[in-house]
Interface confidence: medium
């Protein structure tokens, strides 16, 4: 694992994987299908979705002082999105195209989250609702929204790892 004893991650490895995640998230987004907006949703940002915010220690100074706060936040987000991508939202009808990058995206989220998980240490992960089979139009709308949100999340994570690789690597 990349965080032996919970010290610092393999920044370069994390940077490479996070950049791959960015590419996959952008390539997956247009492929989730046409959205049938038969029912409007709430358009506010929900508190249940992990965001990387100012107080999370992901700024250059925060990463220098103690990168664990930021890495824990990123880890929570990766697990959150990994669960969503593995849920009925993406596995149910309408089926994704056989060559869809969503499968790769799911695997890469899991891979990066494992790189960040310290040996023998388990960060608390956010509970997400039990994602019971939703109607096809709901799945399409959710796929669109989840991937859009994931793009923003991995873009910030990639910047964090790029900074770490450039300035914090041993």
């Amino acid at each position: 694992r990349a965080v032996p004893g919970g010290s610092s991650p393999a920044w370069t490895q994390c940077q490479q994987l996070s950049q791959k995640l960015c590419t996959l998230a952008w390539s997956a987004h247009p492929l989730v299908g046409h959205m049938d907006l038969r029912e409007e949703g709430d358009e506010e940002t929900t508190n249940d979705v992990p965001h990387i915010q100012c107080g999370d220690g992901c700024d250059p100074q925060g990463l220098r002082d103690n990168s664990q706060f930021c890495l824990q936040r990123i880890h929570q987000g990766l697990i959150f999105y990994e669960k969503l991508l593995g849920s009925d939202i993406f596995t149910g009808e309408p089926s994704l195209l056989p060559d869809s990058p969503v499968g790769q995206l799911h695997a890469s989220l899991l891979g990066l989250s494992q790189l960040l998980q310290p040996e023998g240490h388990h960060w608390e992960t956010q509970q997400i609702p039990s994602l019971s089979p939703s109607q096809p139009w709901q799945r399409l709308l959710l796929r669109f929204k989840i991937l859009r949100s994931l793009q923003a999340f991995v873009a910030v994570a990639a910047r964090v790892f790029a900074h770490g690789a450039a300035t914090l690597s041993p």
């Epitope: 949703g41 997400i128 109607q135 709308l141 959710l142």
Partner: antibody, heavy 127, light 108 residues
Framework: EVQLLESGGGLVQPGGSLRLSCAAS????????MQWVRQAPGKGLEWVSR????????RYADSVKGRFTISRDNSKNTLYLQMNSLRAEDTAVYYC????????????????????WGQGTTVTVSS | DIQMTQSPSSLSASVGDRVTITCRAS??????LNWYQQKPGKAPKLLIY???SLQSGVPSRFSGSGSGTDFTLTISSLQPEDFATYYC??????????FGQGTKLEIK
């Protein structure tokens, strides 16, 4: 204890208005989609309206559309049903109920079962 | 709107009997089917959601099955407290969430 308590029912003349309230306790009200369901005397259950967790998405039965307005105040843990232009056929016991569905990314998902109900409040529309 | 038809509309049975109530949707509703029990003067109580999932706290003698258009609520061994009216409800197509007309279960 998870509880819903309706109030505001009563006798009203045709064409009149009433506002029903439903006070929630024992759970995080702001996370749940909520419903109103009614039952006319001696009749079955009729779904009336639904509101998403933040109040941003509402739905109505055709029979009340344009006359009833569902709303919520999450800071007060309270659900409302404003009923205008009341008709004799609106006479019923009105129940508020919590929806099993969850809102994620602004979309209500889940099965729409109602797992917690209030005791009901009676609305009588008569001249 | 999707119509829900329950049968029978009333039913007489004895304590210990196995009872089956059926619900048919006018079009496929996948597994979006819930069952409620209501006693006179009381609010409905959720028994089964998602066609076959037993709601927490509901006795295991209640079970649900079906998918698509045809659904069944079964009470394996009727108890005195089970005499009530039962409603099915679809939540596939909203609005509206439509209920069946109810099945009144009475003591024989």
């Amino acid at each position: 204890e998870v509880q819903l308590l309706e109030s505001g029912g009563g006798l009203v003349q045709p064409g009149g208005s009433l506002r029903l309230s439903c006070a929630a306790s024992g759970f995080t009200f702001s996370k749940y989609t909520m419903q109103w369901v009614r039952q006319a005397p001696g009749k079955g259950l009729e779904w009336v309206s639904r509101i998403s967790s933040s109040g941003g998405a509402t739905r109505y039965a055709d029979s009340v559309k344009g006359r009833f307005t569902i709303s919520r105040d999450n800071s007060k843990n309270t659900l409302y049903l404003q009923m205008n232009s009341l008709r004799a056929e609106d006479t019923a016991v009105y129940y508020c109920a919590r929806d099993l569905g969850q809102t994620i990314f602004g979309v209500v998902i889940g099965f729409g079962g109602m797992d917690v109900w209030g005791q009901g409040t009676t609305v009588t529309v008569s001249s | 709107d999707i119509q829900m038809t329950q049968s029978p509309s009333s039913l007489s049975a004895s304590v210990g009997d196995r009872v089956t109530i059926t619900c048919r949707a006018s079009q496929s509703i996948s597994s979006y089917l819930n069952w409620y029990q209501q006693k006179p003067g009381k609010a409905p109580k959720l028994l089964i959601y998602a066609a076959s999932s037993l709601q927490s706290g509901v006795p295991s003698r209640f079970s649900g099955s079906g998918s698509g258009t045809d659904f069944t609520l079964t009470i394996s061994s009727l108890q005195p407290e089970d005499f009530a009216t039962y409603y099915c409800q679809q939540s596939y197509s909203t609005p509206p969430y439509t209920f069946g007309q109810g099945t009144k279960l009475e003591i024989k």
